[in-house]
C-alpha cells in the first residue's frame, strides 16, 4: 500500500477512500510541484498507467472516473510530465478500498462445552464484505438487566466466570463496518440448557468368534452429566450410507454396544452425544475403523435377518456422506433403519 508517501500535491477520492463496491468513483489529483507546469497528469492503478476516462480540470488538477468500481483494493498514484524532465514526477498516492455493508448475522448459536469454562457463540457472517468488519456480541442478563459487550471477528468465547450473576441471557450480534451496521435476531439462552457433554471417544472394538459373530464397540466420555443420549453411526468404508443406532448412556462406566455386521469388512464408527432432551450435539467423534473377522460358516450371511436378532423398527436416520474422505459432511435422507438387538444376553444398547 501507499501509506507513507511524500506528496507534492494532493489526491482525494469521491465518495471516499472506502466506498461501496459497484459505485461510480472519481479520483482527483492536484499537483503542487515547484518549477513545473505539467504538460500531462497521469493516473496509475496498482502500478499500471490508466488510459481512459481522464479529464484535465485545470492546469493543476485532473480527474479519473471509474464506472462501477468493483476491486476490493487498489493502490492509486498520479504523476506529472514536467517539461525538461526525462522521468514523470510523483505527485501523490492513495490506498482505496471497496466493499459491502455487512449482512445481518444469522444462525446465532451459543454452547458451553463441558469443562471448557466458556460459552462459545458462533454465527454466519453472510457474504464477504472485503473491508474490516467487526462483530459486537451483546450479552444481557434477563434477571439483572446488566449488559456486557464483546468484540469479535467471527466467533466469541465468553468466560462463564463473567456469567455468574444469572442463568438466563439474551444474546445478539451486531455486524459493523464503515459502510453500515446490521443486527442478528436475539437468542434466548439458559446456561443449563446449552451444555454439550465432554467428548465421546470410541476406544476399541472386537469381533467375537461365535457362530454368529458380533462386534462389540467400547466407548467412553468424561462427562459428569447423568442423562446422556447418544447416536453411533457406522458403515463399511466402501459404502456412502451410514446406519445409526441410538443409546441412552450412563458414563459412570465404559459403554459397550453390540453390532451384527458383514464379515470380512472394514467398518468405520463414529459417536456423538447430547444431554438428554437438549438441543445441542457434540461433533461426531473421530472415525474409528474396525475390520470384522472372516466368515467361518458357509451360510449366506444376511445382517439384521438372522434368527438371533429381533427386528425392531426405529425412527432413526440414514445419512449419506458427500465423500468417503469427508465423513463429517453429509446430507440427511429420509429413511427408517431397523435396529437389531440380540435375542438374549446382557446388552446396554436398548434405547
Amino acid at each position: 500500500g501507499i501509506t507513507s508517501i511524500n506528496c507534492s500535491g494532493d489526491m482525494w477520492v469521491e465518495p471516499g477512500e472506502i466506498f461501496q463496491m459497484g459505485m461510480n468513483v472519481s479520483i482527483y489529483c492536484q499537483e503542487a510541484l515547484k518549477h513545473c507546469r505539467p504538460r500531462n497528469l497521469y493516473f496509475y492503478k496498482n502500478g499500471f498507467k490508466e488510459e481512459f476516462d481522464i479529464t484535465r480540470i485545470n492546469r493543476t488538477t485532473a480527474r479519473i472516473w471509474y464506472k462501477g468500481f468493483s476491486e476490493p483494493h487498489a493502490y492509486m498514484h498520479c504523476t506529472a510530465e514536467c517539461p525538461g524532465h526525462f522521468q514523470e514526477t510523483l505527485i501523490c498516492g492513495k490506498d482505496i478500498s471497496s466493499g459491502h455493508p455487512p449482512d445481518a448475522p444469522s444462525n446465532l448459536t451459543c454452547v458451553i462445552y463441558e469443562y471448557s469454562g466458556n460459552m462459545t457463540c458462533t454465527w454466519n457472517t453472510g457474504k464477504p464484505t472485503y473491508i474490516d468488519t467487526k462483530y459486537i456480541v451483546h450479552v444481557k442478563s434477563l434477571e439483572t438487566e446488566e449488559e456486557q459487550q464483546y468484540l469479535a471477528s467471527s466467533y466469541v468465547k465468553i468466560s462463564t466466570d463473567s456469567l455468574q450473576g444469572s442463568r438466563k441471557y439474551l444474546v445478539w450480534v451486531q455486524a459493523v463496518n464503515s459502510l453500515g451496521m446490521e443486527n442478528s435476531q436475539q437468542l434466548h439462552v439458559h446456561l443449563d440448557d446449552i451444555v454439550i457433554p465432554s467428548a465421546s471417544i470410541i476406544s476399541r472394538a472386537e469381533t467375537t468368534n461365535d457362530t454368529v459373530p458380533k462386534t462389540i464397540v467400547y466407548w467412553k466420555s468424561k462427562t459428569m452429566i447423568e442423562k446422556v443420549f447418544c447416536e453411533m453411526r457406522y458403515k463399511t468404508t466402501t459404502n456412502q450410507t451410514w446406519s445409526v443406532k441410538e443409546f441412552d448412556a450412563n458414563f459412570t462406566y465404559v459403554q459397550q454396544s453390540e453390532f451384527y455386521l458383514e464379515p470380512d469388512s472394514k467398518y468405520v464408527f463414529q459417536v456423538r452425544c447430547q444431554e438428554t432432551g437438549k438441543r445441542n450435539w457434540q461433533p461426531w467423534s473421530s472415525p474409528f475403523v474396525h475390520q470384522t473377522s472372516q466368515e467361518t460358516g458357509k451360510r449366506n450371511w444376511q445382517p439384521w435377518s438372522s434368527p438371533f436378532v429381533h427386528q425392531t423398527s426405529q425412527t432413526v436416520s440414514q445419512v449419506t456422506a458427500k465423500s468417503s474422505h469427508e465423513p463429517q459432511k453429509m446430507e440427511m435422507l429420509s429413511a427408517t433403519i431397523f435396529r437389531g438387538h440380540p435375542a438374549s444376553g446382557n446388552h446396554q444398547d436398548i434405547g
Epitope: I131, Y150, L151
Partner: nanobody, 116 residues
C-alpha cells in the same frame, strides 16, 4: 487494565456544537478498537461511531454528516466532534475500548443535554 476518562459534555442549544474527549491510560490504547457509544434514559446503549484498523470509521445513520471521530495517538486520546446537535442527541456518552474476544471496557461517561 486500560482506564478511560471522558470529558467535554454539557448543555447546549439545538444546532450547537460540543467536542467530547476520551483519554486512555493503563496501557497504549492502540490495541483497542475505540468507539463512542451513547445511552438515552430508558434505552439500550448504542454505538455512535467506531474506528477500524483499516482507518475507516463507522457512523450511526442518525449522526452521519454531523459527528466526526478523530484520534491523537501521541496523547492516547480520541475525540467526538458533534455539530448541528439535536434534542434527540441527549444522552450519556461513553467511549469504549474493545479488544478481540474481551469484554468492552467503558469510561464513566459524560452527559450531553440538547435543548430546543
Amino acid at each position: 487494565q486500560v482506564q478511560l476518562q471522558e470529558s467535554g459534555g454539557g448543555s447546549v442549544q439545538a444546532g450547537g456544537s460540543l467536542r467530547l474527549s476520551c483519554a486512555a491510560s493503563g496501557y497504549t490504547y492502540s490495541s483497542c478498537t475505540m468507539g463512542w457509544y451513547r445511552q438515552a434514559p430508558g434505552k439500550e446503549r448504542e454505538l455512535v461511531s467506531m474506528v477500524f484498523s483499516d482507518g475507516s470509521t463507522f457512523y450511526a445513520d442518525s449522526v452521519k454528516g454531523r459527528f466526526t471521530f478523530s484520534q491523537e495517538n501521541a496523547k492516547n486520546t480520541v475525540y467526538l466532534q458533534m455539530n448541528s446537535l439535536k434534542p434527540e442527541d441527549t444522552a450519556m456518552y461513553y467511549c469504549g475500548c474493545a479488544t478481540l474476544g474481551s469484554r468492552t471496557i467503558w469510561g464513566q461517561g459524560t452527559q450531553v443535554t440538547v435543548s430546543s
